[in-house]
Every structure is written in structure tokens, then in C-alpha cells.
């Protein structure tokens, strides 16, 4: 990216922890206003690799509640509605940023944390290992 | 975890913007150390709803680089390797947190932002609308 001069209105950065400790405004700006409101909310049932959603709550994390996908079957649903074990249902995982209260139980101090979440499932052709 | 009285080591919360403006330590703690490093990195090719990955870079955002999935086909790949248009490839989307520099170009001041990203694709049975 192109380097742009430092904004003179930036907060003071003389903190001894700078630049590792920063100020963050928690009033979330939502960039998703023009998206289809339905989004992927019914795909978990209609997919050939359907999944269930499990609620994970951690009050020390921001966001506190994350819904995680767990594939329903090892195989995939075929045209007859049966599970085909020649194919595999696998979770699609993504590394996301969350904020972790640090020190614990503090309302106004956090540390960035990366966690791996399963967002949904997809149907893949298995990797077949042939024995020599 | 067990609730402990509000930690006396919490940063001062007398800021006029409290609790909306918080301190965040950017030294990222990675909770994913025990995960399979391969993860879903080859699923985009092996899926019956394959996708391409597109790089999205924004220097005003943290993380500045996000890889987004775009489904390759409208339909899904069948057992013969052909696209079956009786099924649909659809993106699995997730709302994630990012940090947006605010004011712009400041190294130590951010605002939380929610963005919708496509993580991968799944194959779904289409919703058929019957005309009366």
C-alpha cells in the first residue's frame, strides 16, 4: 500500500508500550448493511454436507458468543437423500481475531487473540492412499 | 471459569468515552497451536463446490490482508467431474471483527468493524419456486 503521512489528530503515542498497546473504539461499525439479509442462515440444512451449530460462550472474550459448525456426517448426502461414504463432509475453518479481557474480568482492557472456528462444511473427494 | 472480583489491576476507566474506548494489546495470542497446519487449505480444489481465493488488501485495516472465497461455478461438480446445475454452489459467509484505523492513517488508534467474508463454498439443493 501507499504510505500516507501520519494524521496530526492521532492520539499521543508516547506510551511505553507503544505501538503494541492501542486505543480501540468498541462502537462497532457494520460494513454489511447492503448484504442479503438471509445470507447463509439456511445452508446448514440444505447442504450436501449439512452441519449443526453449537453455541460457544466465553464472557472473557469479545465477541462472547460464537456459533460453531460441526458436520453432521462423515460422508455427503447424495441425490437420494442418503449418506454417501465415498465422499467426505469436512469443516471449512477460518482463523479470526477476537479480543480477550486482559487482565481477566476487566471491562476496558483486552488483548488480541486468534482463534480457529469452523464456519460450515463442504463436500470433498477423499484423498485415497494406495498401498504399494 | 470462576468469577473473581473486578481485577484491581484493570486500567483506569474514567475516560469520558468509557466503556466504548478500550486498551488493546496487539501482541496476538494464537490459540491454534495444536491444530493441523494443513487444515482446509486444499479443500477449495477438492470440493464439489470448488472456490478460488482472492486477496483483499487494505492498509487502513488490521489485518490488512484477507483472503476471500469466490465459488467457481453456479452448479456443483458431479461424480463425472461435470457441473450439475440442478445443485448450487453457494458461499459460506461469516461476520468477522477487524480493526479500522480511526482517525485514518493513525498507527495507534482504531475502531472495531464488522465485515462479512466468504470463507469457502458448499453445495446446496436449490429452493424451487413453483408458479401457480
Amino acid at each position: 500500500g501507499i504510505t500516507i503521512p501520519r494524521n496530526p489528530g492521532c492520539p499521543n503515542s508516547e506510551d511505553k508500550n507503544f505501538p503494541r498497546t492501542v486505543m480501540v473504539n468498541l462502537n462497532i461499525h457494520n460494513r454489511n448493511t447492503n448484504t442479503n439479509p438471509k445470507r447463509s442462515s439456511d445452508y446448514y440444512n440444505r447442504s450436501t454436507s449439512p452441519w449443526n451449530l453449537h453455541r460457544n460462550e466465553d464472557p472473557e472474550r469479545y465477541p462472547s458468543v460464537i456459533w460453531e459448525a460441526k458436520c453432521r456426517h462423515l460422508g455427503c448426502i447424495n441425490a437420494d437423500g442418503n449418506v454417501d461414504y465415498h465422499m467426505n463432509s469436512v469443516p471449512i475453518q477460518q482463523e479470526i481475531l477476537v479480543l480477550r479481557r486482559e487482565p481477566p474480568h476487566c471491562p476496558n482492557s483486552f488483548r488480541l487473540e486468534k482463534i480457529l472456528v469452523s464456519v460450515g462444511c463442504t463436500c470433498v473427494t477423499p484423498i485415497v492412499h494406495h498401498v504399494a | 471459569g470462576i468469577t473473581i472480583p473486578r481485577n484491581p489491576g484493570c486500567p483506569n476507566s474514567e475516560d469520558k468515552n468509557f466503556p466504548r474506548t478500550v486498551m488493546v494489546n496487539l501482541n496476538i495470542h494464537n490459540r491454534n497451536t495444536n491444530t493441523n497446519p494443513k487444515r482446509s487449505s486444499d479443500y477449495y480444489n477438492r470440493s464439489t463446490s470448488p472456490w478460488n481465493l482472492h486477496r483483499n488488501e487494505d492498509p487502513e485495516r488490521y489485518p490488512s490482508v484477507i483472503w476471500e472465497a469466490k465459488c467457481r461455478h453456479l452448479g456443483c461438480i458431479n461424480a463425472d467431474g461435470n457441473v450439475d446445475y440442478h445443485m448450487n454452489s453457494v458461499p459460506i459467509q461469516q461476520e468477522i471483527l477487524v480493526l479500522r484505523r480511526e482517525p485514518p492513517h493513525c498507527p495507534n488508534s482504531f475502531r472495531l468493524e464488522k465485515i462479512l467474508v466468504s470463507v469457502g463454498c458448499t453445495c446446496v439443493t436449490p429452493i424451487v419456486h413453483h408458479v401457480a
Partner: antibody, heavy 121, light 107 residues
Framework: EVQLVQSGAEVKKPGSSVKVSCKAS????????IHWVRQAPGQGLEWMGV????????FYNQKFDGRVTLTADESTSTAYMELSSLRSEDTAVYYC??????????????WGQGTTVTVSS | DIQMTQSPSSLSASVGDRVTITCRAS??????IDWFQQKPGKAPKRLIY???DLASGVPSRFSGSGSGTDYTLTISSLQPEDFATYYC?????????FGQGTKLEIK
């Protein structure tokens, strides 16, 4: 102004089903889960389950043994609670309440006005 | 399920009194406690969240404390509008459970 407005009182026969609605306004519907809590006459509060309008995820109190179904319609910002195989002990006031997914510290801050369900033969 | 036991189940007090209501969890694997106030015919109103914090618009005479399995709601100086039923709720262990309630009446 945040509001959760529930549907009106219902009188049902044992064995039938009831569906209570909860229309949300004044906030982004998908940023919050909807939890359902009931209160039998003269009794305490009982958590029934939670629905995430964004993902479609649901989690139920096992006590209800599969009789509860929670759904939501994003297009109308309305959550629904359906209770089947009704029995007399399901006579209660049913409440919806919102719960922030972002910060548990903001849980159950706004409640609907309650819907009275009477089960009687 | 974690049981939340409130004590006392009912309490008579006078305006100006200091009142304490306790809530004990059957195990210590909860994350925190919320406290609610309910008046007859009305929906519950959140008073305290995350064990200690005062909900928006709640007078400072209400306070919360506790850790492990034992939690407390304190009203430092009772006002006429405080006579109601109070419930604790545990967060962090499914299903989320409420205490059986404490009815606070005028002496």
C-alpha cells in the same frame, strides 16, 4: 428505542401446539440472540433456549425434551417460539429477551412484555 | 444442571434498611451472575450484570459481589420502589439457570 413486542395471550387444549412471536425493533436484529424464558403462575423464571437469528443456530434446555422449536425471520426481525404437546403445567407467561453476542455483559438487557399461554381442556 | 439457591426466599424490611440477598451455586463452574428485579405483572428488569456491574439507569444503592459459588446482591438503603422479587441467574454452564427468587416485602 429498543423494543421487543410479543404476540397476544393464547388459550390452548392439551396436546396442541402454540407459537408465540417476538418482534424486535430499535437495534440490529442479527447482533443479538433471542433467549426465551417462562414463568408459571406464582413460580420462578425458567430458561427455555436460545436462537441466533444470524446463523440459525439454536440451543435448548433439555428439560423440554424436543417440544420447543425456536426460529427467527430476519426479514421482519421477528423471533418465534413454538411449544408442542402442550400440557397443563405449560400454563405460564412466556418472555423473549435479547442477548448480545458481542458482549455477555450485555445479556438479557431488554425483555418482551410477556405472552400468557393457558393450557386447559 | 447447576442449581442456584437463593436465600432468604422472602424478606420483610423497612424503607432505609440495608438488605442483602445471597445466591449459592451448586458448583463453582459458572462464569458470573446477573441479578434481576421483577414486579407483579411485569417482565424482569436487569439490575446487575457480570456479578459487579450496575445496569444502565439502575440506582447506585444496588451493588453486587461474590465469587466461586457464593454471590450477593445488596441494597444499601431500601426505597419504596424496591419492594419486588429478585432473581439471580448464572451464566457459563448450560442450561442457564435462575434462582427460585427472593420476595422483598414491606415490614
Amino acid at each position: 428505542e429498543v423494543q421487543l413486542v410479543q404476540s397476544g395471550a393464547e388459550v390452548k387444549k392439551p396436546g396442541s401446539s402454540v407459537k408465540v412471536s417476538c418482534k424486535a425493533s430499535g437495534y440490529t436484529f442479527t447482533d443479538y440472540e433471542i433467549h426465551w424464558v417462562r414463568q408459571a403462575p406464582g413460580q420462578g423464571l425458567e430458561w427455555m433456549g436460545v436462537n441466533d437469528p444470524e446463523s440459525g443456530g439454536t440451543f435448548y434446555n433439555q428439560k423440554f425434551d424436543g417440544r420447543v422449536t425456536l426460529t427467527a425471520d430476519e426479514s421482519t426481525s421477528t423471533a418465534y417460539m413454538e411449544l408442542s404437546s402442550l400440557r397443563s403445567e405449560d400454563t405460564a407467561v412466556y418472555y423473549c429477551t435479547r442477548y448480545s453476542k458481542w458482549d455477555s455483559f450485555d445479556g438479557m438487557d431488554y425483555w418482551g412484555q410477556g405472552t400468557t399461554v393457558t393450557v386447559s381442556s | 444442571d447447576i442449581q442456584m439457591t437463593q436465600s432468604p426466599s422472602s424478606l420483610s424490611a423497612s424503607v432505609g434498611d440495608r438488605v442483602t440477598i445471597t445466591c449459592r451455586a451448586s458448583s463453582g463452574i459458572i462464569s458470573y451472575i446477573d441479578w434481576f428485579q421483577q414486579k407483579p405483572g411485569k417482565a424482569p428488569k436487569r439490575l446487575i450484570y457480570a456479578t459487579f456491574d450496575l445496569a444502565s439507569g439502575v440506582p447506585s444503592r444496588f451493588s453486587g459481589s461474590g465469587s466461586g459459588t457464593d454471590y450477593t446482591l445488596t441494597i444499601s438503603s431500601l426505597q419504596p420502589e424496591d419492594f419486588a422479587t429478585y432473581y439471580c441467574r448464572q451464566v457459563g454452564s448450560y442450561p442457564e439457570t435462575f434462582g427460585q427468587g427472593t420476595k422483598l416485602e414491606i415490614k
